[in-house]
């Protein structure tokens, strides 16, 4: 978790002088409670926005917006603490809005926003806005929290962000799988424009149970420049057991920007459907999947049909 690196952070608006400060997430009012404290935020909203750094990199950010309740407690509002908690790592980052002037009665509702928390693809967060000073130990809570799920790198807008491009989001391997004679499977995919090695992993399962019955890994050496964007072929010899027929093929690249953590692409090949005449029918369509690196999400975005999701020919 970090803040976007550019621009002085601003929270001032007409009628209010305000400064944004780094926060330890432990406001002084926790330790030294005040007698009079403001009410909680109203209508907290979290949205996915995108912002450029000074270097021109594009990052997903959490756009946090909330309003004040229309009660007299605004006279005791000294600021706000914004906290973003990454649910899985328990990492927390806070900033503090410090009001340098008192809020005045306003013709319209006071509204605040902040868009500088950088978030990671596929990660889950809890965003909290605490009004300051925080309440006395038995006082009514004066904070509001919302959860926030960041789409992964297959989301159309996420795909072009710097963290996603660094993990290979623009590479479309267009994996095809062909069943050959003699218990063989040919996997074909398009190489990316980088001289980097690849791994092709095959794991087979029985049709009835989800237990693995066969697995093998093949290495593909780094292609030369003239081979960029060409098709690479790998042939696997399958398990001799006819029931070990549900195959999961995964292509893992090792791009220099993401090394072992690059986005993987995969297809699954279901067991063939046997007709009455016992002649195996061709499988109509393989079920394609996008396999993430270990720290990102397996979610698939609506806006992005077709990215590594193709009909695979036999």
């Amino acid at each position: 978790l970090r803040l976007l690196d550019h621009r002085a952070l601003v929270c001032s608006q007409p009628g209010l002088n305000c400064t944004v400060k780094n926060s330890t997430c432990l406001d002084d009012s926790w330790i030294h409670p005040r007698n009079l404290t403001p009410s909680s935020p109203k209508d907290l909203q979290i949205q996915l926005h995108f912002a450029h750094t000074q270097q021109g990199d594009l990052f997903p950010v959490a756009h946090i917006e909330w309003t004040l309740q229309t009660d007299a407690s605004i006279l005791y509002l000294e600021g706000a603490e914004l906290s973003v908690l990454q649910l899985n790592t328990n990492e927390r980052l806070c900033v503090k809005f410090q009001f340098l002037s008192m809020l005045q009665h306003h013709r319209k509702r006071w509204r605040f926003s902040f868009s500088h928390f950088v978030v990671d693809p596929g990660q889950e967060y809890e965003v909290t806005v605490h009004h300051l000073p925080k309440p006395i130990p038995d006082g009514d809570p004066n904070h509001q929290s919302k959860n926030f799920l960041v789409p992964d790198c297959e989301h159309a807008r996420m795909k072009v962000t710097t963290p996603c491009m660094s993990s290979g989001s623009l590479w479309d391997p267009n994996i095809t799988v062909e069943t050959l004679e003699a218990h063989q499977l040919r996997v074909s995919f398009t190489l990316w424009n980088e001289s980097t090695p690849y791994q092709v992993l095959l794991e087979s399962f029985s049709d009835s149970e989800n237990h693995s019955c066969f697995d093998v890994v093949k290495q593909i050496f780094a292609p030369r420049q003239e081979e960029f964007h060409q098709r690479a072929n790998v042939t696997f010899t399958l398990s001799k057991f006819h029931w070990c027929c549900h195959h999961h093929v995964q292509v893992q690249p090792f791009f220099s920007s993401c090394l072992n953590d690059c986005l993987r692409h995969a297809v699954t090949v279901p067991c063939p459907v046997i007709s009455n005449t016992t002649v195996p029918k061709p499988v109509a369509d393989y079920i394609p999947l996008w396999e993430p690196r270990s720290g990102s999400s397996d979610y698939k975005d609506d806006d992005d049909k077709g990215s590594s999701h193709h009909h695979h020919h036999h």
Epitope: L87, T89, N90, S145, K146, L149, P151, S294, D298, Y299
Partner: antibody, heavy 116, light 107 residues
Framework: QVQLVQSGAEVKKPGASVKVSCKAS????????ISWVRQAPGQGLEWMGW????????KYAQKFQGRVTMTTDTSTSTAYMELRSLRSDDTAVYYC?????????WGQGTLVTVSS | EIVMTQSPATLSVSPGERATLSCRAS??????LAWYQQKPGQAPRLLIY???TRATGIPARFSDNGSGTEFTLTISSLQSEDFAVYFC?????????FGGGTKVEIK
Amino acid sequence: QVQLVQSGAEVKKPGASVKVSCKASGYTLTSYGISWVRQAPGQGLEWMGWISAYSGNTKYAQKFQGRVTMTTDTSTSTAYMELRSLRSDDTAVYYCARRQLALDYWGQGTLVTVSS
Amino acid sequence: EIVMTQSPATLSVSPGERATLSCRASQSISSNLAWYQQKPGQAPRLLIYGASTRATGIPARFSDNGSGTEFTLTISSLQSEDFAVYFCQQYDTWPLTFGGGTKVEIK
């Protein structure tokens, strides 16, 4: 291929405890949280809580607070859910699921029957 | 806690027809809604999250509309494998809560 494989069915007496396991494969356990959800026979789904294998942090539904403990063993890529002081209305299928908000992969479920 | 209400409890539809399932939240949950499909004897399966984003491998015939408190799951042309129970779930605030489910059965 992401898989969550749960332990087998259990029959318990009222007042006893049950510990259900959930073994993860096809991804790194510490990369995502594990949530637990239960479903009484013929009923809907009820969220029990989650654990982060990365940090050990937990969040439990208030209803189960003090009666449930969620743990993980990263060496075996396994998550555990222990429910104590069982009552007959705890009879349900208990599911583990990956992630903490929208649950993208689920275990096959473990039926826990509480009966005297 | 946020109460999720699904309607109807049972929906009878012929194969090939459109099915429309409703889910209402007791307060605004923005777009923090997921839909799951559950078949008898199986675990739930994530269909949609973020109110409109399909999960991996979910066909385009599944779509969601709505934000705030009113959500609708639409199955544009029901296939035989779509007959199941569907649950909505909010993940806006703790605790996570599920709707009571809508059973889609063959007419």
